[in-house]
């Protein structure tokens, strides 16, 4: 029995379908077929689970948390026992294994691994403004999603016919800040946050108002 | 088995436009982002910007912008980066490097073998 | 955009020896820098991120450190395989930016 090289790993956008592969080649019928598939999931990695096992010619439930959302892509019994797994959680990320036996057909290598990656875009952003809003202080513009796999990146822009930042501006892309030193009234505006990673953006807005001092009365 | 397989070297004129491709295998196209990066020769590393293969947003660098056009295509697993108005000094290798599978678009984990493209008169 | 600037631009050493390269960003960028190597006729290849993270498969032997405007790069005992260029590359602002490389050659 030889269980073939799977991809390596898969990733999907959570909400989305996962197809986990899994085929072997054997020398018996598949009368005494068994197959156990595992995840060691990346949350909890010393706490390997049963996601769905194939025994006696009828299927079983692995883990409540799959119950529902995991099945085999074909029907049983066949030498491809891939599974799919419906409406992927974060939680489904981790090292997948289908182990295969099939009596009397034994040697050989009768596991496959398959790593899963479920993908986030960005929650919707938090924008906030850190510091004085008088005119000639130092502000700082932060955004931050909660979510996000991979790591979004963070691009802050002024909404105005440019949609450049002052001239006085930084900004951390990776953590969403922007500073803004010594802000002016040509600083007040709408600011936009933009969050973005390869499956997805999220914005929030930002109303920068810049305060100028109150003449004072003499007399 | 993540493999980046870039088209041939290419010569062009100044003035002309090259399209180099990228064809992605060993993982989910559609999940990641490919950046486009370009070497001079005997020079450093330029980034020229990202496109997302999932839903086409790109982000390019500002000196190459409204020259140049990132696009991707789902069905075949491949990126593409056109570059117009070609001058001498676009002569490099341009290479696809696929984002980070942890921090992301801002470093790239896998590349392809690079494309000499060469402007001469 | 943010200048990178590598410091030697070559490096003579031997096998065995700990050799360390810098990089200097114009402005502080954090903990946002990898740093990769690269070979003649090759892709270049990442070797850390975030500033210290190794990534999977490379040698231990590598090490990176530092944040705001100084980093370096470490290897601890040079191998034959480690003689190449490598850059250090930002990613605190867009355009990432890199630096112009450090060569490290066999003395």
């Known amino acids: 029995l030889e269980v073939s090289e799977s991809p390596g790993s898969i990733q999907v956008a959570r909400g989305q379908p996962a197809v986990l592969p899994c085929t072997f080649t054997t020398s018996a019928a598949l009368i005494n077929l068994n197959v156990i598939w595992m995840v060691t999931p990346l949350s909890n990695a010393n706490q390997p689970e049963q996601v769905i096992l194939y025994q006696g010619g009828q299927m079983f439930d692995g883990a409540p948390r799959f119950h529902g959302r995991v099945g085999f892509t074909g029907t049983m019994p066949a030498t491809n026992v891939s599974i799919f797994i419906n409406n992927t959680q974060l939680s489904d990320t981790g090292t997948y294994q289908c182990l295969v036996n099939n009596l009397p057909d034994i040697g050989g290598r009768n596991i496959g691994v398959t790593g899963l990656t479920v993908l986030v875009p960005p929650s919707a952003p938090h924008c906030q403004i850190q510091g004085s809003q008088d005119i000639g202080s130092d502000v700082i513009l932060l955004c931050s999603s909660e979510e996000g796999i991979p790591r979004p990146t963070y691009l802050w822009e002024k909404l105005d016919n440019t949609l450049k930042l002052p001239p006085t501006a930084t900004q951390d892309q990776v953590q969403g800040t922007v500073t803004i030193r010594n802000i002016s009234a040509l600083s007040s505006g709408l600011y936009q946050c933009v969050a973005s990673n390869a499956i997805g953006t999220s914005t929030c807005l930002l109303d920068l108002q810049v305060i100028s001092p109150q003449p004072r009365n003499i007399g | 088995q993540v493999q980046l397989v870039q088209s041939g070297a290419e010569v062009k004129k100044p003035g002309a436009s090259v399209k180099v491709s990228c064809k992605a295998s060993?993982?989910?196209?559609?999940?990641?982002?490919i950046s486009w990066v370009r070497q001079a020769p005997g020079q450093g590393l330029e980034w020229m910007g990202w496109?997302?293969?999932?839903?086409?947003?790109?982000n390019y660098a500002q000196k190459l912008q409204g020259r140049v056009t990132m696009t991707t295509d789902t069905s075949t697993s491949t990126a593409y980066m056109e570059l117009r108005s070609l001058r001498s000094d676009d002569t490099a290798v341009y290479y696809c490097a696929r984002d980070h599978s942890i921090v992301g678009a801002t470093t790239f984990d896998y590349w392809g073998q690079g494309t000499l493209v060469t402007v001469s008169s | 955009d943010i200048v990178m600037t590598q410091s030697p631009s070559t490096l003579s050493a031997s096998v065995g020896d700990r050799v360390t390269i810098t990089c200097r960003a114009s402005q502080s960028i954090s903990s946002w820098l990898a740093w990769y190597q690269q070979k003649p006729g090759k892709a270049p290849k990442l070797l850390i991120y975030d500033a210290s993270s190794l990534e999977s498969g490379v040698p231990s032997r590598f090490s990176g450190s530092g944040s705001g405007t100084e980093f370096t790069l470490t290897i601890s005992s040079l191998q034959p395989d480690d003689f190449a260029t490598y850059y250090c590359?930002?990613?605190?602002?867009?355009?990432?930016?890199f630096g112009q490389g450090t060569k490290v050659e066999i003395k």
């Open positions: 496109i997302s293969a999932y839903n086409g947003n790109t």
């Open positions: 060993g993982y989910t196209f559609t999940s990641y982002g």
């Open positions: 590359q930002q990613y605190n602002s867009y355009p990432w930016t």
